[in-house]
């Protein structure tokens, strides 16, 4: 079958890293510099991706595989194959159109990327707040008052004082 296929299409014999050169009687030519073919039987080689600017090279291009990029420090990858780099923020912040901004009161972000998420509502699960939430950390829920043994007091602290810049808007 392979022999029959190769008689029908000589290009099918060209391995990855080469291309079937129509200008040279369909012989297999190596991919030129800065290009690659990841599968056999290709009639052209693809141009290698170049990791420039905020992108940096994670894996060099070879004759059989494309380059892979990641982001320079202070940025993180977005999209398939790191198609974009997005600015990091500090924990307790989110990236807005005006740059990194503190999480609004009642929300938190424990990462350098992504958006602020609302604190867990302990009462939805019939529990009480054991540790208050902050801009960087979610609340910690404790047992419901009914779960506490007789004589024990609930450890629900008062509502946290609003931090500067975190009044509800």
């Amino acid at each position: 079958f392979e022999r029959t296929r190769s008689l029908q299409d000589p290009c099918s014999n060209c391995p990855a890293g080469t291309f079937c050169d129509n200008n040279r009687n369909q012989i297999c030519s190596p991919c030129p510099p800065n290009s690659f073919s990841s599968a056999g039987g290709q009639r052209t080689c693809d141009i290698c991706r170049q990791c420039k600017g905020v992108f940096r090279t994670r894996k060099e291009c070879s004759s059989t595989s494309n380059a892979e990029c990641d982001c320079t420090p202070g940025f993180h990858c977005l999209g398939a194959g790191c198609s974009m780099c997005e600015q990091d923020c500090k924990q307790g912040q989110e990236l807005t159109k005006k740059g990194c901004k503190d999480c609004c009161f009642g929300t938190f972000n424990d990462q350098k990327r992504g958006i602020c998420r609302p604190w867990t509502n302990c009462s939805l699960d019939g529990k009480s707040v054991l540790v208050n939430g902050t801009k960087e950390r979610d609340v910690v829920c404790g047992p419901s008052p009914a779960d506490l043994s007789p004589g024990a007091s609930s450890v629900t602290p008062p509502a946290p004082a609003r931090e500067p810049g975190h009044s509800p808007q």
Epitope: G79, T96, G114, I115
Partner: antibody, heavy 125, light 110 residues
């Protein structure tokens, strides 16, 4: 081509449950934040829920919090909305929408660029 | 009652210009990017503007967006009868941790 195909709408009694599905094709689903948006008869658009590309962060409108659950199966390129304790106020056309190619970015900020055809949910006895 | 306010209706003659406003607050329109959508009744919404002022491919430059403070504006020039539709602004609200839409504006081309 890029498209979102919805299924799962229908008539349900008050207090009942329903699951909506949204099958994606033609784009990198796992890199796209996704949203559900609804429109009650004769009313405007209402954002219902959103989920990050990886599925690790979900967000809800106050009107559905605790009753609706958004989820996704990136291996099947499918988004879901599980709806419980339905009331007449949930009657609407439900749309799924792709929030753009930014796995960690905000749900709505980059615009919802691809929309499903919509599926009607009617809650009535 | 929507967190983000739009006029219920606007109208203008063919070939003229129309402006639709979208008023929010410092946790949505003033903080996060605004998108604009066009919806012809009975069909799904269509993205017109994202990131305050960017147009997706295929959207004519008759449509433009801008923001100032906690307000956003959609301008449509060279009005055509085919522009008759409902228009919505949308943004992420960082206080609510939720998406918000304006109430919608019905555009009539006289």
């Amino acid at each position: 081509q890029v498209q979102l195909v919805q299924s799962g709408g229908g008539l349900v009694q008050p207090g009942g449950s329903l699951r909506l599905s949204c099958a994606a094709s033609g784009f990198t689903f796992s890199s796209s934040a996704m949203s559900w948006v609804r429109q009650a008869p004769g009313k405007g658009l209402e954002w219902v829920s959103g989920i990050s590309g990886s599925g690790d962060s979900a967000y809800y409108a106050d009107s559905v919090k605790g009753r609706f659950t958004i989820s996704r199966d990136n291996s099947k390129n499918t988004l879901y909305l599980h709806m419980n304790s339905l009331t007449a106020e949930d009657t609407a056309v439900y749309y799924c929408a792709s929030g753009g190619n930014y796995g960690s970015g905000t749900i709505v900020s980059h615009g919802m660029d691809v929309w499903g055809q919509g599926t009607t949910v009617t809650v009535s006895s | 009652q929507s967190v983000v306010t739009q006029p219920p209706s606007v109208s203008a003659a063919p070939g003229h210009k129309v402006t639709i406003s979208c008023s929010g607050n410092s946790s949505n329109v003033g903080r996060n990017y605004v998108s604009w959508y066009q919806q012809v009744p009975g069909t799904a919404p269509k993205l017109l503007i994202y990131d305050d002022n960017k147009r997706p491919s295929g959207i004519p430059d008759r449509f433009s967006g801008s923001t100032s403070g906690a307000s956003a504006t959609l301008v449509i020039t060279g009005l055509q009868t085919g522009d008759e539709a409902d228009y919505y602004c949308g943004a992420w609200d960082s206080s609510l941790s939720a998406g918000v839409f304006g109430g919608g504006t019905k555009l009539t081309v006289l």
